[in-house]
């Protein structure tokens, strides 16, 4: 058993049929010695008396808010949460496996630039009685500071019969140099509590590996005389690291109709303009990627051909 | 247009070209190592990230773009500020800090060159003959060093009398290649920046 926060404790349980469970001793936080009784949650049934209460925690029915009283007055609370371990593996029931970039990916993180600011998000089908707490650091043995905000519900989607909820959090490394060469990864730890179930999820990454620039901005078209070709120009996104001659991007320019199956024109360039063939009812799209370290491409920025 | 439009300095341009070749060569070599040593811990997640140049050179600091010298987090280990002699830049544009930057890059390359050559000698003794260093990568390191044109004492190639542990050597190769790729990215950024300045 360990303390998650004040008066909240996590009991780690090997979860299998007829498991013996864990013996837990609760102590009432009071100078009083006599006349103390214990109850669980809203029940008035007295579980025991005395300053300490010894319980055998085996299942979720044994978890919950234990309260010690004296003469009708509440002295203190202890909330017990369960963390299940099945076949040596901690449960991951609360969050959905996003399966990208690989299986057992529960947290996904992205950074728009090298400033040390990044966003992580996760998915769940649970809508109520759910809380998250996020901590982060650079390295684990001698951790350096990363400050994370509160996790917020950022999107709701309908997937078949189910509703899916996306939560996200923004974090900022306390003293980040955009030009630095990372040798210690960022560690992100998310504590998830659903009712009386506790789970924790972690992700470890280098900022350089989670870079995904914003789409290029100010796409403009200039038809070329006596030709079906069009010069398309754009600018670096505002959120990208500067100077741009140091943090350079490379671009992919594509002309395609509404359907992905339609034919297309595609060209890659390090410049902020390119010449392509425009077709009726097609769109010109441009996306960006770090020129020197191939992490993710940005989303497309598009303009219609006409 | 955000990128500075500058006529490439004829002195700088060869270094930009060589640094692009360097990044390409080390990336290819790393990819080859990952594929060949698939049963060894050779991915970015599996290895310890070590920098053989740590406390010996200060490339990131010495080559920091002027725009980032205002960032306190970038200045923690800087004794001096900003990014030459070397043949990469026309002499009119040289400055003490640029010289420091390019000489730091040269020292990096020299250290990695020695490490890679020592390692290759060991790998050539491996009866499995599983992996060797790409001669192209070694040649590209050499070309960039020549383009930088700094003179410094020759670092003797390390030789070891004990029987090499090929497993450890291959893991060290992965560690070195990952670190060198990261440094090659920095070198490429620096050359691009200098070329545009």
């Amino acid at each position: 058993i360990w303390e998650l926060k004040k008066d909240v404790y996590v009991v780690e349980l090997d979860w299998y049929p007829d498991a013996p469970g864990e013996m837990v001793v609760l102590t009432c936080d009071t100078p009083e010695e006599d006349g103390i009784t214990w109850t669980l949650d809203q029940s008035s049934e007295v579980l025991g008396s005395g300053k300490t209460l010894t319980i055998q925690v085996k299942e979720f029915g044994d978890a919950g808010q234990y309260t010690c009283h004296k003469g009708g007055e509440v002295l203190s609370h202890s909330l017990l949460l369960l963390h299940k371990k099945e076949d040596g593996i901690w449960s991951t029931d609360i969050l959905k496996d996003q399966k990208e970039p690989k299986n057992k990916t529960f947290l996904r993180c992205e950074a728009k630039n090298y400033s040390g600011r990044f966003t992580c998000w996760w998915l769940t089908t649970i809508s109520t009685d759910l809380t998250f707490s996020v901590k982060s650091s650079r390295g684990s043995s001698d951790p350096q500071g990363v400050t994370c905000g509160a996790a917020t519900l950022s999107a709701e989607r309908v997937r078949g019969d189910n509703k899916e909820y996306e939560y996200s959090v923004e974090c900022q490394e306390d003293s980040a140099c955009p030009a630095a060469e990372e040798s210690l990864p960022i560690e992100v730890m998310v504590d998830a509590v659903h009712k009386l179930k506790y789970e924790n999820y972690t992700s470890s990454f280098f900022i350089r590996d989670i870079i995904k620039p914003d789409p290029p901005k100010n796409l403009q078209l200039k038809p070329l005389k006596n030709s079906r070709q069009v010069e398309v120009s754009w600018e670096y996104p505002d959120t990208w690291s500067t100077p741009h001659s140091y943090f350079s991007l490379t671009f992919c320019v594509q002309v395609q109709g509404k359907s992905k199956r339609e034919k297309k024109d595609r060209v890659f360039t390090d410049k902020t303009s390119a010449t392509v063939i425009c077709r009726k009812n097609a769109s010109i799209s441009v996306r960006a990627q770090d020129r020197y370290y191939s992490s993710s491409w940005s989303e497309w920025a598009s303009v219609p051909c006409s | 247009r955000n990128l500075p439009v500058a006529t490439p300095d004829p002195g700088m341009f060869p270094c930009l070209h060589h640094s692009q070749n360097l990044l390409r060569a080390v990336s290819n070599m790393l990819q080859k190592a990952r594929q060949t040593l698939e049963f060894y811990p050779c991915t970015s997640e599996e290895i310890d990230h070590e920098d053989i140049t740590k406390d010996k050179t200060s490339t990131v600091e010495a080559c920091l773009p002027l725009e980032l010298t205002k960032n306190e987090s970038c200045l923690n280990s800087r004794e001096t500020s900003f990014i030459t002699n070397g043949s990469c830049l026309a002499s009119r544009k040289t400055s003490f800090m640029m010289a420091l930057c390019l000489s730091s890059i040269y020292e990096d390359l020299k250290m990695y060159q020695v490490e890679f050559k020592t390692m290759n000698a060991k790998l050539l003794m491996d009866p499995k003959r599983q992996i060797f260093l790409d001669q192209n990568m070694l040649a590209v390191i050499d070309e960039l060093m020549q383009a930088l044109n700094f003179n410094s004492e020759t670092v003797p190639q390390k030789s070891s009398l004990e029987e090499p542990d090929f497993y450890k050597t291959k893991i060290k190769l992965c560690i070195l290649l990952h670190a060198f790729r990261i440094r090659a990215v920095t070198i490429d950024r620096v050359m691009s920046y200098l070329n545009a300045s």
């Epitope: 079906r228 070709q229 490379t250 199956r261 339609e262 034919k263 297309k264 024109d265 595609r266 060209v267 890659f268 360039t269 390090d270 010449t275 063939i277 077709r279 009726k280 | -």
Partner: antibody, heavy 118, light 107 residues
């Protein structure tokens, strides 16, 4: 599967014209760009131009401007390349090639040998 | 127009050996570079597109790399069916242009 079948070999006199055909099958004809590439005996490949069968748009290499006409007949899924004012150095194998992507060539015809000789 | 130069013109390699073919562009073409194989009396066949992207059905021993002005096609272990002429082609700008080819012959 996607296939391009070209017309047979031709022998032409200098100054004459030649029209090579390329019949597509195994895909919707208007879904791919069509290119013409030629190869002189023992020489390399030379791109001549492309046509979009959907709208008839074409683009030619400057070298062939005014001397080449590329057309398509969507009813028969056939592309044609006509080269006029033939010279002896036009002697080559002429290939049609197709792709959903405009700038490279995924599927090739078997080639048509055109000999220009007096 | 962009001029593509391939080297060497002829490469003599023993079966099972590694072959490295080079292609250089007269100006930077990013990764807009494609490789083809042509056997005598046959049409060319696409091997690699956009410098390094592999094509399904093409053996994994063929790989491409490079960007800017310098590109490489590598055949990791030459098989008898790989002896042919290899062409690079740029798609950075029109007119599309090919290199002069590299003939890979049996040593």
């Amino acid at each position: 599967q996607v296939q391009l079948v070209q017309s047979g070999a031709e022998v032409k006199k200098p100054g004459a014209s030649v029209k090579v055909s390329c019949k597509a099958s195994g895909y919707t004809f208007t879904d791919y760009y069509l290119h013409w590439v030629r190869q002189a005996p023992g020489q390399g490949l030379e791109w001549m131009g492309w046509i979009d069968p959907e709208n008839g748009d074409t683009e030619h290499a400057p070298k062939f401007q005014g001397r080449v006409t590329m057309t398509t007949d969507t009813s028969t899924s056939t592309a044609y390349m006509e080269l006029r004012s033939l010279r002896s150095d036009d002697t080559a194998v002429y290939y049609c090639a197709a792709n959903k992507e405009l700038r490279y060539f995924d599927v090739w015809g078997q080639g048509t040998m055109v000999t220009v000789s007096s | 127009e962009i001029v593509m130069t391939q080297s060497p013109a002829t490469l003599s390699v023993s079966p099972g050996e590694r072959a490295t073919l080079s292609c250089r562009a007269s100006q930077s073409i990013s990764i807009n570079l494609h490789w083809y194989q042509q056997k005598p009396g046959q049409a060319p066949r696409l091997l690699i597109y956009f410098a390094s992207q592999s094509i399904s059905g093409i053996p994994a021993r063929f790989s491409g790399s490079g960007s800017g002005t310098e590109f490489t096609l590598t055949i990791s272990s030459l098989q008898s069916e790989d002896f042919a002429v290899y062409y690079c082609q740029q798609s950075n700008s029109f007119p599309l242009t090919f290199g002069g080819g590299t003939k890979v012959e049996i040593k």
